[in-house]
Interface confidence: low
């Protein structure tokens, strides 16, 4: 028979002849021949291989770097790689979290919308109308006014988006 | 049907040689890999030889390594076995197998899927 | 070269029971593509050795179901869910990872 020119799923080709590929996890040590297949080992502690492949030596599992503010979040398997996560109050720099950065502070009228995860940074959104921010956090929200009026009291300093307003008591009509 | 018929067992004198023949018919012997394999009178079976589709590859125990000669013509579908300086414990039936794979098709692997009936070598004074 | 070692030796079986063969080899008949690379024969009396099942698991063409292939790596097991007269006979496993091929002592199954 002739010669392949391409092979099956999870085989590879080499010296006109399809051999099957190391599964994930493990490398190739020696191609196949007439009378022997493809000859794999599993890969070393701190390594991976993640799909069906003919490499012969292993990737090395990532390296969550604590001096980056980096911890590990999922071990690395032989099949797969190391996930690095950022420490308690840190977000990654990218997708790939190589680094971390401390979580923005929302500033004096500004509240938190979306509070930050190890993979993606604060949201702060401007204290609308009725509602007041008066500290530089990465946690809290606009808070809204107080009510004056539920208190039996009056308004004697409007608030703004960075101060909560002042209540003081009605003046009482002189009899 | 698939067949496998093996002759040129007989009855030699240690030292001397012979020469087995297998004769294949009912599918395409040029795209199969064939085995010789032997069974000793009251034993077990032994794995003697591999010879690949296209003769180009060729693979010995070490009891018959320097001895034994495998080697096949596709134009006759015959697969042969060339057995010089016999010893006594070479006495044994012989069987040729076919190994069940297409061609170069490494992936697919389907066991030794067709047998011959056997020959028997005895080797004696 | 891989040394397959099988028990027992000698099975006697009751007709409709189920029996079991076990074979060992000396290293992992399972390579990178995950298939193990052993197979089961069986030899009636006074005939050729059949072929049952290849790659650890795969009933050959023409094989009753009743015969099955299971293990991983070096600890494989055929097994005959309800024996009948004339599955009696020399059982060998093979691999077939390596040349050398190596063969297992063979299992004689006979009736009681």
């Known amino acids: 028979p002739e010669p392949p020119t391409a092979c099956r799923e999870k085989q590879y080709l080499i010296n006109s002849q399809c051999c099957s590929l190391c599964q994930p996890g493990q490398k190739l040590v020696s191609d196949c021949t007439e009378f022997t297949e493809t000859e794999c080992l599993p890969c070393g502690e701190s390594e991976f291989l993640d799909t069906w492949n003919r490499e012969t030596h292993c990737h090395q599992h990532k390296y969550c770097d604590p001096n980056l503010g980096l911890r590990v979040q999922q071990k690395g398997t032989s099949e797969t790689d190391t996930i690095c996560t950022c420490e308690e109050g840190w977000h990654c720099t990218s997708e790939a979290c190589e680094s971390c950065v401390l979580h923005r502070s929302c500033s004096p009228g500004f509240g938190v919308k979306q509070i930050a995860t190890g993979v993606s940074d604060t949201i702060c959104e401007p204290c609308p109308v009725g509602f007041f921010s008066n500290v530089s956090s990465a946690f809290e929200k606009c808070h809204p006014w107080t009510s004056c009026e539920t208190k039996d009291l009056v308004v004697q300093q409007a608030g703004t988006n960075k101060t909560d307003v002042v209540c003081g008591p009605q003046d009482r009509l002189r009899a | 049907q698939v067949q496998l018929v093996e002759s040129g067992g007989g009855v030699v004198q240690p030292g001397r040689s012979l020469r087995l023949s297998c004769v294949a018919s009912?599918?395409?012997?040029?795209?199969?890999?064939m085995h010789w394999v032997r069974q000793a009178p009251g034993k077990g079976l032994e794995w003697v030889a591999i010879?690949?589709?296209?003769?180009?590859?060729?693979y010995y125990a070490d009891s018959v390594k320097g001895r034994f000669t495998i080697s096949r013509d596709n134009s006759k579908n015959t697969l042969y076995v060339q057995m010089n300086s016999l010893r006594a414990e070479d006495t044994a039936v012989y069987y040729c197998?076919?190994?069940?794979?297409?061609?170069?098709?490494?992936?697919?692997?389907?066991?030794?899927?067709?047998w011959g009936q056997g020959t028997t070598v005895t080797v004696s004074s | 070269d891989i040394v397959m070692t099988q028990s027992p030796l000698s099975l006697p079986v009751t007709p409709g029971e189920p029996a079991s063969i076990s074979c060992r080899s000396s290293?992992?008949?399972?390579?990178?593509?995950?298939?193990?690379?052993l197979d089961w024969y069986l030899q009636k009396p006074g005939q050729s050795p059949q072929l049952l099942i290849y790659?650890?698991?795969n009933r050959a063409s023409g094989v009753p179901d009743r015969f099955s292939g299971s293990g991983s790596g070096t600890d494989f097991t055929l097994k005959i869910s309800r024996v009948e007269a004339e599955d009696v006979g020399v059982y060998y496993c093979?691999?077939?990872?390596?040349?050398?091929?190596?063969f297992g002592q063979g299992t004689k199954v006979e009736i009681k």
């Open positions: 290293q992992s008949l399972l390579p990178g593509n995950g298939y193990n690379y």
């Open positions: 790659l650890g698991s």
């Open positions: 009912g599918f395409t012997f040029s795209n199969y890999g």
């Open positions: 010879i690949s589709y296209d003769g180009s590859n060729k």
């Open positions: 093979m691999q077939a990872l390596q040349t050398p091929r190596t």
């Open positions: 197998a076919r190994r069940g794979h297409y061609g170069r098709d490494y992936y697919s692997y389907y066991g030794l899927d067709v």
